[in-house]
């Protein structure tokens, strides 16, 4: 047993049928020696009476909010979580799998650029007395500095009966040095806790791995004289990192007709123009990426051929 | 990355041809080198991250650029004199050009050449003759060190004579890439910078 | 403490109404408050619930057909367009109001709605 | 989400002994509930958290279970047990607070 916050513990289980469960000792914080009992939740059956309560934790019913009373007066309380063993692993229900990058990742991260300022979202189907901390560190061993705020409710999405929720935090290395070299990863860790359940995730990344840049802007087409050929410019996010001659992008261009069927052209550049044929219904897109670490593209920022 | 991509003009500043083809050369060693050794922990997240030229050369601080000199997290052992020779900065007036930048990024390439032909001539040795080094990264090294055109002591290679563990060996390999793929692109954004300059 | 339901009647299809449940004893913004229904001979059947906090949310096949909210003492479900197929008796009940959500221990005795033309 | 109640009516001599079934589509934990409910009147409270008696429940009545598979255990039957008894998750508002089929007990 430990404790997560103050009067708040998380009891490890092994969760398999006929498990033994734990034996957990509760302190009824008070000087009062006599004349103490305990009750579990909102039921007035009294448990057991004295300054400790012995219980033996094996399912959910024996977690929830133990109070300490007497004489018909609340003096203190604490409130078990479970946190469940399977088969030698913890279990993890509340989040979703995502499955991208690789299979078990429930936790993702994207960074808009080197600032040591990010983003991790997480998905999950339960609506309700669900909550979320979060905690981050670069390194392990001698952990420095990143603040996160509170995890908010992102995006609900319908996905067939269902419902999606998405939750996501911001956090900011506390003394980041955009142009760095990453040798110690990034540590985030989420406690969930639903209901009595407790789950931690983790998720361990450089910053460079995770840079999404924001699409180009002020993307615009110059017709070129007597000709089919158009000429395309576009400028720098304001989000990326500064000076772009040192953080610089390299970009992609793509003409798509209406159909997507049809085939696309791709021009790769390193420069913010390019000439291309603008053909009839098609549109032209252009996306960015850094020139030199190649991370996730950003997304595409478009506009009509005509 | 293979993309199409529009070939640098040959009148620019003359390092950044040479630093970009350093990038793309270390990058194809590291993706063969994983590919080579997939069951051999070789990916980002299973490797050590250590940095060989860790408190013998400070490119990232020498090389800073001046618009990040601001910033109080970025000038841990900053030095601030200027350099004034290597052939990269011929006609090149630029107040960016901090001592130690161009000769650190020399350094860094000298110590990394002499670990990556050590451990070439430990991996040649190898009776399952598994992965060598690519020689046309050693070529880049070379002609990047040559354009950097600084003078300095030969460092010996080392030589060692117990029998080598292979296994370590490859695994010291990807380590080594890594960090060099890593330094290799600061190098390249120094480059650009420079060039912009 | 006691939660009693009202406003229950013959309505023609597609005429709105709204039943109202009505609270004593305890205040609404620390229980979650559920409506179920049960048709003549039927099983319960859950509409959908409004938490301590005011969120409401509803079983899937409701698709916008009730609407529940809630004031300091009452808690309202509204059917915004009726059809035969919703004659039930209509039961609110309150939750446990434990730390974490709610099994829902105080029902009141229902209200017969009749949808008939 | 459903929850899937077994078997839909039972039959019993007095004092012997009943089980009800409530097969749930995912994981629910312990968050089950069993109800009482006879003719004109609303449900009852029986059980809570799958195996928690409620207040001025008689302890013949007996909840266990957890996860997806739930039993709700009657002994020492008497008359005044004729009834339906419904379970119902409490899981999670998306996953719903839904009831399962009912399981009418007749006293013989």
């Known amino acids: 047993i430990w404790e997560l916050k103050k009067d708040v513990y998380v009891v490890e289980l092994d969760w398999y049928p006929d498990a033994p469960g734990e034996m957990v000792v509760l302190t009824c914080d008070t000087p009062e020696e006599d004349g103490i009992t305990w009750t579990l939740d909102q039921s007035s059956e009294v448990l057991g009476s004295g300054k400790t309560l012995t219980i033996q934790v094996k399912e959910f019913g024996d977690a929830g909010q133990y109070t300490c009373h007497k004489g018909g007066e609340v003096l203190s309380h604490s409130l078990l979580l479970l946190h469940k063993k399977e088969d030698g692993i913890w279990s993890t229900d509340i989040l979703k799998d995502q499955k991208e990058p690789k299979n078990k990742t429930f936790l993702r991260c994207e960074a808009k650029n080197y600032s040591g300022r990010f983003t991790c979202w997480w998905l999950t189907t339960i609506s309700t007395d669900l909550t979320f901390s979060v905690k981050s560190s670069r390194g392990s061993s001698d952990p420095q500095g990143v603040t996160c705020g509170a995890a908010t409710l992102s995006a609900e999405r319908v996905r067939g009966d269902n419902k999606e929720y998405e939750y996501s935090v911001e956090c900011q290395e506390d003394s980041a040095c955009p142009a760095a070299e990453e040798s110690l990863p990034i540590e985030v860790m989420v406690d969930a806790v639903h209901k009595l359940k407790y789950e931690n995730y983790t998720s361990s990344f450089f910053i460079r791995d995770i840079i999404k840049p924001d699409p180009p802007k002020n993307l615009q087409l110059k017709p070129l004289k007597n000709s089919r050929q158009v000429e395309v410019s576009w400028e720098y996010p304001d989000t990326w990192s500064t000076p772009h001659s040192y953080f610089s992008l390299t970009f992609c261009v793509q003409v798509q007709g209406k159909s997507k069927r049809e085939k696309k052209d791709r021009v790769f550049t390193d420069k913010t123009s390019a000439t291309v044929i603008c053909r009839k219904n098609a549109s032209i897109s252009v996306r960015a990426q850094d020139r030199y670490y190649s991370s996730s593209w950003s997304e595409w920022a478009s506009v009509p051929c005509s | 990355r293979n993309l199409p991509v529009a070939t640098p003009d040959p009148g620019m500043f003359p390092c950044l041809h040479h630093s970009q083809n350093l990038l793309r050369a270390v990058s194809n060693m590291l993706q063969k080198a994983r590919q080579t050794l997939e069951f051999y922990p070789c990916t980002s997240e299973e490797i050590d991250h250590e940095d060989i030229t860790k408190d013998k050369t400070s490119t990232v601080e020498a090389c800073l650029p001046l618009e990040l000199t601001k910033n109080e997290s970025c000038l841990n052992s900053r030095e601030t004199s200027f350099i004034t020779n290597g052939s990269c900065l011929a006609s090149r007036k630029t107040s960016f050009m901090m001592a130690l930048c161009l000769s650190s990024i020399y350094e860094d390439l000298k110590m990394y050449q002499v670990e990556f032909k050590t451990m070439n001539a430990k991996l040649l040795m190898d009776p399952k003759r598994q992965i060598f080094l690519d020689q046309n990264m050693l070529a880049v090294i070379d002609e990047l060190m040559q354009a950097l055109n600084f003078n300095s002591e030969t460092v010996p290679q080392k030589s060692s004579l117990e029998e080598p563990d292979f296994y370590k060996t490859k695994i010291k390999l990807c380590i080594l890439l890594h960090a060099f793929r890593i330094r290799a692109v600061t190098i390249d954004r120094v480059m650009s910078y420079l060039n912009a300059s | 403490q006691s939660v009693e339901e009202s406003g229950g009647r013959l309505v023609t299809p597609g005429t709105p109404l709204t039943l109202t449940c009505t609270v004593s004893?305890?205040?609404?913004?620390?229980?979650?408050m559920i409506w179920v229904r049960q048709a003549p001979g039927e099983g319960l059947e859950w509409i959908g619930i409004?938490?301590?906090?005011?969120s409401a949310y509803y079983a899937s096949w409701v698709n916008g057909r009730f609407t529940i909210s809630k004031t300091s003492t009452t808690v309202d479900l509204k059917m915004t367009s009726p059809t035969t197929g919703d004659t039930a008796t209509y039961f609110c009940?309150?939750?446990?109001?434990?730390?974490?959500?709610?099994?829902?221990?105080?029902w009141g005795p229902g209200t017969l709605v009749t949808v008939s033309s | 989400f459903e929850l899937t109640q077994t078997p839909s009516s039972v039959e019993a001599a007095v004092g012997g002994t009943v089980t009800i079934k409530c097969q749930a589509s995912?994981?629910?934990?312990?968050?089950l509930a069993w109800y009482q409910q006879k003719p004109g009147q609303p449900p009852k409270l029986l059980i809570y958290?799958?195996?928690k008696l409620a207040t001025g429940v008689p302890s013949r009545f007996s909840g266990s279970g957890s996860g997806t598979q739930f039993t709700l255990t009657i002994s020492d039957l008497e008359c005044a047990d004729a009834a339906t008894y419904y379970c119902?998750?409490?899981?999670?508002?998306?996953?719903?607070?839904?009831f399962g089929g009912g399981t009418k007990v007749v006293v013989v």
């Open positions: 009940a309150r939750g446990s109001g434990t730390y974490t959500s709610d099994y829902f221990n105080i």
């Open positions: 004893g305890f205040s609404l913004s620390s229980y979650t």
């Open positions: 409004i938490s301590a906090g005011g």
């Open positions: 995912q994981s629910i934990d312990s968050w």
């Open positions: 958290s799958a195996s």
């Open positions: 119902q998750s409490y899981y999670d508002a998306n996953a719903g607070y839904g």
